[in-house]
């Protein structure tokens, strides 16, 4: 259940997809990745106010209990709902190879 | 990839399964659930320090970028890796029914 997509905190403040530019050095990949030299990393960032993009029943429960016990139960968290694959050219023992990673770039976000 | 399960912050401080006791009133379910009257809600709570229970490559990237840009990129977040089903006795228009929810109780946790 993808609940409300209206952000009560103002435009762009709630859980959504952001792009962060990162070099191989930033990612700690310089020693095993040849290309690309820079990655447009898509990730999920933003607040998860009550019922905003609630992923499932668990997220709805978490919202209710966070309201009651904010020191014990954290608010839901903005995480990937799905991923886009990414291809890297990697260094290997025998040379180089293409490797596809299915869990590297966020495609869509929700709160859980 | 489930990376390190050793918590550098001290016992019980990192992402793990917690149980929070909640009444139907706490959950806002009193008007549509008959039983159970109280739920032992299992949820994922705790910090996600570098590579602790990293769910996948995305979590590893997030850790690296959070170190570099802590104001822009949040640390990974402790969320359910899997769920246990839970059966509720619900009120319906015609009486009551058993309903199983697959996404209500966290079974296992990871950082993402």
């Amino acid at each position: 259940a993808r609940n409300g997509d209206h952000c009560p905190l103002g435009p762009g403040r709630c859980c959504r997809l952001h792009t962060v530019r990162a070099s191989l050095e930033d990612l700690g990949w310089a020693d095993w990745v040849l290309s690309p030299r820079e990655v447009q990393v898509t990730m999920c960032i933003g607040a998860c106010p009550s019922q905003f993009r609630a992923a499932n029943m668990h997220a709805q429960i978490k919202t209710s209990l966070h309201r009651l016990k904010p020191d014990t139960v954290p608010a839901p968290c903005c995480v990937p709902a799905s991923y886009n694959p990414m291809v890297l050219i990697q260094k290997t023992d025998t040379g180089v190879s293409l490797q596809t990673y299915d869990d590297l770039l966020a495609k869509d976000c929700h709160c859980i | 990839a489930r990376n390190g399960d050793h918590c550098p912050l001290g016992p019980g401080r990192c992402c793990r399964l917690h149980t929070v006791r909640a009444s139907l009133e706490d959950l806002g379910w009193a008007d549509w659930v008959l039983s159970p009257r109280e739920v032992q809600v299992t949820m994922c709570i705790g910090a996600c320090p570098s590579q602790f229970r990293a769910a996948n490559m995305h979590a590893q990237i997030k850790t690296s970028l959070h170190r570099l840009k802590p104001d822009t990129v949040p640390a990974p977040c402790c969320v359910p890796a899997s769920y246990n089903p839970m059966v509720l006795i619900q009120k319906t228009d015609t009486g009551v029914s058993l309903q199983t929810y697959d996404d209500l109780l966290a079974k296992d946790c990871h950082c993402i």
């Epitope: 290309s35 690309p36 898509t42 694959p85 990414m86 291809v87 050219i89 293409l98 770039l105 | -």
Partner: nanobody
Framework: QVQLVESGGGLVQPGGSLRLSCAAS????????IGWFRQAPGKGREGVSC????????YYSDSVKGRFTTSRDNAKNTVYLQMNSLKPEDTAVYYC????????????????WGQGTQVTVSS
């Protein structure tokens, strides 16, 4: 109209060969890196090979290395994927994509895509 069109797919027995073509119209392939991808039922898109624009360097995934070869014929504005020693696990829809960045071509980036050609390896 700018487009990529794949052809050459079909049904082949294990151990057999196929040659896929990726023909461009409306733009010149010379300046583009060309990636071949495949998508098996219920799976994500996997990068199979890439040929760079400048020096024609080629890159392959471990799963096809030594069996698949990619080449380009700039005069025909076409890139080929020669597939030998085919296995049942090579069964998928095969796509080509063109991108102005160096290899690897990445599926989440907006660039030119073909519509795909089905390859089925079965006895």
């Amino acid at each position: 109209q700018v487009q990529l069109v794949e052809s050459g797919g079909g049904l082949v027995q294990p151990g057999g060969s196929l040659r896929l073509s990726c023909a461009a119209s409306g733009f010149t392939l010379d300046y583009y890196a060309i990636g071949w991808f495949r998508q098996a039922p219920g799976k994500g898109r996997e990068g199979v090979s890439c040929i760079s624009s400048n020096d024609g360097s080629t890159y392959y995934s471990d799963s096809v290395k030594g069996r698949f070869t990619t080449s380009r014929d700039n005069a025909k504005n076409t890139v080929y994927l020669q597939m030998n020693s085919l296995k049942p696990e090579d069964t998928a829809v095969y796509y080509c994509a063109a991108d102005l960045t160096p290899c690897p071509v990445n599926p989440s980036v907006d660039h030119y895509w073909g519509q795909g050609t089905q390859v089925t390896v079965s006895s």
